[in-house]
Amino acid sequence: ELENLTVTEVGWDGLRLNWTAADQAYEHFIIQVQEANKVEAARNLTVPGSLRAVDIPGLKAATPYTVSIYGVIQGYRTPVLSAEASTGETPNLGEVVVAEVGWDALKLNWTAPEGAYEYFFIQVQEADTVEAAQNLTVPGGLRSTDLPGLKAATHYTITIRGVTQDFSTTPLSVEVLTEEVPDMGNLTVTEVSWDALRLNWTTPDGTYDQFTIQVQEADQVEEAHNLTVPGSLRSMEIPGLRAGTPYTVTLHGEVRGHSTRPLAVEVVTEDLPQLGDLAVSEVGWDGLRLNWTAADNAYEHFVIQVQEVNKVEAAQNLTLPGSLRAVDIPGLEAATPYRVSIYGVIRGYRTPVLSAEASTAKEPEIGNLNVSDITPESFNLSWMATDGIFETFTIEIIDSNRLLETVEYNISGAERTAHISGLPPSTDFIVYLSGLAPSIRTKTISATATTEALPLLENLTISDINPYGFTVSWMASENAFDSFLVTVVDSGKLLDPQEFTLSGTQRKLELRGLITGIGYEVMVSGFTQGHQTKPLRAEIVTEAEPEVDNLLVSDATPDGFRLSWTADEGVFDNFVLKIRDTKKQSEPLEITLLAPERTRDITGLREATEYEIELYGISKGRRSQTVSAIATTAMG
């Protein structure tokens, strides 16, 4: 059963229904809400069968409604319950106040019932103009808002309404006057130079969009120079001014189309910078030293012109860093008058030119570099020089082909000669000499020298002389020769010359098969690419042939006899005896004896028989001349 339907208001736009029902399983409830005077169609709601209460929102304020409800169980409708109730009156806004007023904005506060409005509609209108109002909406939960973008010193009417879906409250209004635009603070000039100045000013932070600076020459009607700078700046460099000139500088702030009253300041730029006190002094014979004074302004650079007084066409220009106050100018002619000019450059401006004249000193002289006493590994140098000036002389020795390391000698300024040694033979050199005196080095003078050639081929030596030949040896520079030619000629020029060609690596030749005991001339030449050296020569006589002599027979017996002989000492390796009967009736007897022997007893022969005896020596495989004798054995 459905009963106890009660209806209570829920604010001005809603009703709350409560009912009771047995805890059967209602499928759902049907609720009908209708204005009592039936102006609008009824609203029907279906709610779940488990509910026993429901809110009905979105109704009209202060309006009587008839509410009826029935339940549905298994398609069966319960009897309808009805009740009547009215919605409450619409809420009104409380009060509106202006909490803060600035020159371009204000803060609006108001009161209102909680949750009553979806949003608030605020209108901002200049009081005395027909300009369109500014409209804005703010969420219904807010009770305060900022209104920016207003004009300074202006009357505004501000209205506010609370708005729900279909209802707007009676507007509340308030009138307000915005404040004046704030004034600028102080304008000062903090730095002044000849072509620029720096402005500083004070102002409330974040007030201005931008500042306008106007720079005007005080006594001129020329167009002013205007600059616009961001509102965040409090300082500004004003470049490009004229030196020694009075200027009026004005500054005003701008904010949303409003300009402050201008601030003004008068200032005079400084006079043009000048260079002062140019001094020129000599730095030896080939240079000058310049000193000058200048204010410590940031000179970009100095331009110096150096010119021989008598040669206006050939000037030397130098550009130097602006930090310098002195410079050496080298590379000038000795004993020459020069005119030196200087000007400084600051931000494109040239200072007036300063000039001075000075002469370089007379050049100390060196000359007559001479090379003498050349050997394969050394030479002597001599030269002339101005006395009493030089501290040291520098000698550089460079080989013309640049294959060797440069050798440098530093010797006393009192010397006029030098001995250069340890050089390679057959080498071309260039000798450079310069003198050093305090702060100067003379021009370098030079001479050429070539060390003599070493003998490429030398020390022809004859050794191992024997009756049939000898050994020829020589010395030669490594890799100097492609080949050697050894020529052997007998001293009497009776025989044809013998020529032997040897490779360039060989250094000796053993000669054999020559004639004993005669004179020979030996010549050795080297060949380089077909070019022949002058020959080395030597003369030699071959030894006489070693002799065996004085073959004697003694002490004859029936079967033999004793033989003795003489021979050159230390020549023979051994001796050979040949013995045969003169009638050739028996085989010959041949005996080989060792070299030291000079006698031999012969036995085993036939009695009373005549024998022919031959003896020769053997030396290095060659036989000496044979000596002979006849011997007869005794009767038995």
């Epitope: 050639a453 490429l456 030619l485 002058k534």
Partner: antibody, heavy 118, light 107 residues
Framework: EVQLLESGGGLVQPGGSLRLSCAAS????????MGWVRQAPGKGLEWVSA????????YYADSVKGRFTISRDNSKNTLYLQMNSLRAEDTAVYYC???????????WGQGTLVTVSS | SELTQDPAVSVALGQTVRITCQGD??????ASWYQQKPGQAPVLVIY???NRPSGIPDRFSGSSSGNTASLTITGAQAEDEADYYC???????????FGGGTKLTVL
């Protein structure tokens, strides 16, 4: 009759290359040392390079070392001079010449002109 | 040049003329002598101590003393008018060197 005939000369730009050849006849080429001598216009003779009989040993003047290469092909009786990185000062008539072991250059070709110019 | 020659020498027809060549290498090596006529290749005229290739007239002779080599033409002929170059070796580093040449004029 000994004959040496050079070829391969011509006009070349500085930095360019040329290869000279010398065809030999009338003597035992493989038994002779060979060489190149040049003569700049209106100037004296300047030895350039030489090579031994088998080609295993080569010799160069300092002025051409590292730029010129001498070689020979005994099977073709031909001598070569490969010239790289040519300079204006290499402009000359280049002569091919032979020499026996114990005699300097005894036969010369008629020469080929090399002009190095841009 | 490592071998130094006089640039020009003249001789009357039939007279004797001596052309010299100086250089350190000539202390060790004999000079060789070449004759070159305009537009022609050089021709060897003297080599070694005093050797003439076949076909070279015997009026040409060579000699050497110290660092000087000489080419002598005894009874100069009109056809001897030419440039003469001395030639030698300077050892392994400079195996062939030429003198600067001497222009011989036969008057």
């Amino acid at each position: 009759e000994v004959q040496l005939l050079e070829s391969g000369g011509g006009l070349v730009q500085p930095g360019g290359s040329l290869r000279l050849s010398c065809a030999a006849s009338g003597f035992t080429f493989s038994g002779s040392r060979m060489g190149w001598v040049r003569q700049a216009p209106g100037k004296g003779l300047e030895w350039v390079s030489a090579i031994n009989e088998e080609g295993g040993q080569t010799y160069y003047a300092d002025s051409v070392k590292g730029r010129f290469t001498i070689s020979r092909d005994n099977s073709k009786n031909t001598l070569y001079l490969q010239m790289n990185s040519l300079r204006a000062e290499d402009t000359a008539v280049y002569y091919c010449a032979k020499h026996p072991p114990h005699r300097p250059f005894d036969y010369w070709g008629q020469g080929t002109l090399v002009t190095v110019s841009s | 040049s490592e071998l130094t020659q006089d640039p020009a020498v003249s001789v009357a027809l039939g007279q004797t003329v001596r052309i010299t060549c100086q250089g350190d290498s000539l202390r060790s090596y004999y000079a060789s002598w070449y004759q070159q006529k305009p537009g022609q290749a050089p021709v060897l005229v003297i080599y070694g101590k005093n050797n003439r290739p076949s076909g070279i007239p015997d009026r040409f002779s060579g000699s050497s003393s110290g660092n000087t080599a000489s080419l002598t033409i005894t009874g100069a002929q009109a056809e001897d008018e030419a440039d003469y170059y001395c030639n030698s070796s300077h050892g392994p580093r400079r195996p062939v060197v030429f003198g600067g040449g001497t222009k011989l004029t036969v008057l």
